[in-house]
């Protein structure tokens, strides 16, 4: 995933004190034995900090070395810091692991901004607050990097949860989740509940706080309300989906739906913002500006450069529109919509200079690589990555931040014709995923 532009993301306190929890609704989905129910040991296993990533604790090697690892559904390598770096408190020391095996192969991963490079090997890996299993997985031991690790982020590596097609150096390097499923009885599915705080967190609050849950191998009922709605995974590389319609406060953007997916649309936990293709971004901003025109915001706000602030507790959420993305459904000519609030797309930012106010950054930005449904989207929902059935599920998150007037929503079905035409076919080249 594009690490320079797609800064890993933001988290918060589980249940977010400023966010009201919705009452449970009846789950109309049929039970799927072994894949649903309670996963108490995995709930609240993510932590993080605004704009810097949600991470899970993992252990690598024998004896186990504990590291915090960024959860990234937008890449496919398990890569960890393996040499001293000014931004790392700790790193993987291969020489201390009796189970480390060198693959005698290097890996180099450039991004639009920055890069990391390292040496490939395998070792025993487990997730303390995950399934009670240990797997031998491929590990890229990062020996050199530029603009990859983030000062103060508290994570030392990245867990790429996407498919082998985008693994580096090539698709023969089996991703961690594939290894996990092959070597254990863990079902081929994971789900993420990312909980935005609704307010900025300082370092000590972050270290003591909960940022959400990664449920490996199943779905936890307690983490969502209402029903799960599924959209097909269009192609198993990134978690690619198809957006068929976009509305701002119920007003259709009225664009050719191909534009929404140009050149792809992906679900990426490693990106902070909702990123939109240039034309779509411009149309969306124009519509959001019009809807919120009772206040005049600086141009720099829409660019993500300037913060906007209000006296503490007086943020006029009601002047900002809701944003709905309609996703292709599982049934022919059927779609469903996911709706986010300004509480998701206005990111709270702490600034000492304006500490008496509540300040926010606009967390929708322009993309040259398609739509990226990052934390801004995911923090509203419980997201199920059902790899076994090649689909992604969305339900309203039990921890999403909202107010007494509006909540995030997942609703359907809607009749939508010719949805297949909304997908963009990327011209295939050997380098098609390089520098994304």
């Amino acid at each position: 995933t594009q690490h320079g532009i797609r800064l890993p993301l933001r988290s918060g306190l589980g249940g977010a004190p400023l966010g009201l929890r919705l009452p449970r609704e009846t789950d109309e989905e049929p039970e799927e034995p072994g894949r649903r129910g309670s996963f108490v040991e995995m709930v609240d296993n993510l932590r993080g900090k605004s704009g810097q990533g949600y991470y899970v604790e993992m252990t690598v090697g024998s004896p186990p070395q504990t590291l915090n690892i960024l959860v990234d559904t937008g890449s496919s390598n398990f890569a960890v810091g393996a040499a001293p770096h000014p931004f790392l408190h700790r790193y993987y020391q291969r020489q201390l692991s009796s189970t480390y095996r060198d693959l005698r192969k290097g890996v180099y991963v450039p991004y639009t901004q920055g890069k990391w490079e390292g040496e490939l090997g395998t070792d025993l890996v487990s997730i303390p607050h995950g399934p009670n299993v240990t797997v031998r997985a491929n590990i890229a031991a990062i020996t050199e990097s530029d603009k990859f690790f983030i000062n103060g982020s508290n994570w030392e590596g990245i867990l790429g949860l996407a498919y082998a097609e985008i693994a580096r150096p090539d698709d023969s390097l089996e991703p961690f989740f594939d290894s996990l499923v092959k070597q254990t009885h863990v079902p081929n599915l994971f789900s993420l509940q990312l909980c935005g705080a609704g307010f900025p967190l300082n370092q000590s609050e972050v270290l003591a706080s909960v940022g959400g849950s990664m449920i490996i191998g199943g779905i936890d009922h307690s983490l969502y309300t209402g029903s799960l709605w599924y959209t097909p995974i269009r192609r198993e590389w990134y978690y690619e989906v198809i957006i068929v319609r976009v509305e701002i406060n119920g007003q259709d953007l009225k664009m050719d739906c191909k534009e929404y997916n140009y050149d792809k649309s992906i679900v990426d936990s490693g990106t902070t913002n909702l990123r939109l293709p240039k034309k779509v971004f411009e149309a969306a901003v124009k519509s959001i500006k019009a809807a919120s025109s009772t206040e005049k915001f600086p141009d720099g706000f829409w660019l993500g450069e300037q913060l906007v602030c209000w006296q503490a507790g007086t943020t006029p959420w009601n002047i900002f529109p809701v944003i709905s993305l309609y996703l292709m459904g599982e049934v022919t000519n059927q779609s469903f919509r996911i709706t986010i609030l300004p509480q998701q797309y206005l990111r709270p930012v702490e600034d000492v200079a304006t500490s008496q106010d509540d300040c926010y950054k606009f967390a929708i930005s322009q993309s040259s690589t398609g739509t990226v449904m990052g934390a801004v989207i995911m923090e509203g929902f419980y997201v199920v990555f059902d790899r076994a059935r090649k689909r992604i599920g969305f339900a309203v998150s039990a921890c999403h931040v909202h107010d007494e007037f509006r909540t995030a929503a997942v609703e359907g079905p809607f009749v939508t014709l010719d949805m297949e035409d909304c997908g963009y076919n990327i011209p295939q080249t050997d380098e098609s995923t390089l520098m994304t």
């Epitope: 320079g4 532009i5 800064l7 605004s50 704009g51 810097q52 639009t112 901004q113 983030i150 000062n151 103060g152 206040e295 005049k296 915001f297 600086p298 141009d299 720099g300 993500g304 450069e305 300037q306 913060l307 906007v308 602030c309 930012v349 600034d351 000492v352 200079a353 304006t354 300040c359 950054k361």
Partner: antibody, heavy 116, light 107 residues
Framework: QVQLVQSGAEVKKPGASVKVSCKAS????????IHWVRQAPGQGLEWMGM????????KYNQKFKARATLTVDTSTSTVYMELSSLRSEDTAVYYC?????????WGQGTLVTVSS | DIQMTQSPSSLSASVGDRVTITCKAS??????VAWYQQKPGKSPKSLIY???HRYSGVPSRFSGSGSGTDFTLTISSLQPEDFATYFC?????????FGQGTKVEIK
């Protein structure tokens, strides 16, 4: 606390280039844009441009677009401003400033003197 | 570009005086105006943002008002450390522009 520390004074000949640095600390570097503003002796303030440290996206004042280049090194939390084809009227104090609402934080300034 | 015209360009006042500086934008900038104080040989210090909000740590004697095109900075009771040059800035649209400054001198 937030600090922006700039490099020292420079004396340059007309036609030369100068590169001024601004090292940031006390906040998450990639969360805020850095701006450059200059002030000629006894004059007002003039905005030159800005850079987003998270992705190196830049935006310039048209007046400086041809001669100014802003770059970033996130590994050292440092932003650079290079001004080329210097002329005597470029003699000024160059400030970096951090965004937020307007410019809450400023560097101490770097005096660039252009003289033959 | 948006022009920011400050007046007066200089003024003389005594400690304890109430001082008012105005700034006029050439077009509507909403409330996206900031004020800065600068002393000789020093960098600007942020005083006011969003036309009327004081930055943290700024004394309450400094206040700002206005919206649209007309803005005012008021120092309710001038203190010895307030003798300096004051600049307004619009950050509504690019390029960001500043007023030419108002020098507040001791009478």
């Amino acid at each position: 606390q937030v600090q922006l520390v700039q490099s020292g004074a420079e004396v340059k000949k007309p036609g030369a280039s100068v590169k001024v640095s601004c090292k940031a600390s006390g906040y998450t570097f990639t969360n805020y844009w850095i701006h450059w503003v200059r002030q000629a002796p006894g004059q007002g303030l003039e905005w030159m441009g800005m850079i987003d440290p998270s992705d190196s996206y830049t935006k310039y004042n048209q007046k400086f677009k041809a001669r100014a280049t802003l770059t970033v090194d996130t590994s050292t939390s440092t932003v650079y401003m290079e001004l080329s084809s210097l002329r005597s009227e470029d003699t000024a104090v160059y400030y970096c400033a951090r965004s937020g609402v307007a410019f809450p934080y400023w560097g101490q300034g770097t005096l660039v003197t252009v003289s033959s | 570009d948006i022009q920011m015209t400050q007046s007066p360009s200089s003024l003389s006042a005594s400690v304890g005086d109430r001082v008012t500086i105005t700034c006029k934008a050439s077009q509507d900038v909403g409330r996206n105006v900031a004020w800065y104080q600068q002393k000789p040989g020093k960098s600007p210090k942020s005083l006011i943002y969003s036309a009327s909000h004081r930055y943290s740590g700024v004394p309450s004697r400094f206040s700002g008002s206005g919206s649209g095109t007309d803005f005012t900075l008021t120092i309710s009771s001038l203190q010895p450390e307030d003798f300096a040059t004051y600049f307004c800035q619009q950050y509504n649209s690019y390029p960001y522009t500043f007023g030419q400054g108002t020098k507040v001198e001791i009478k």
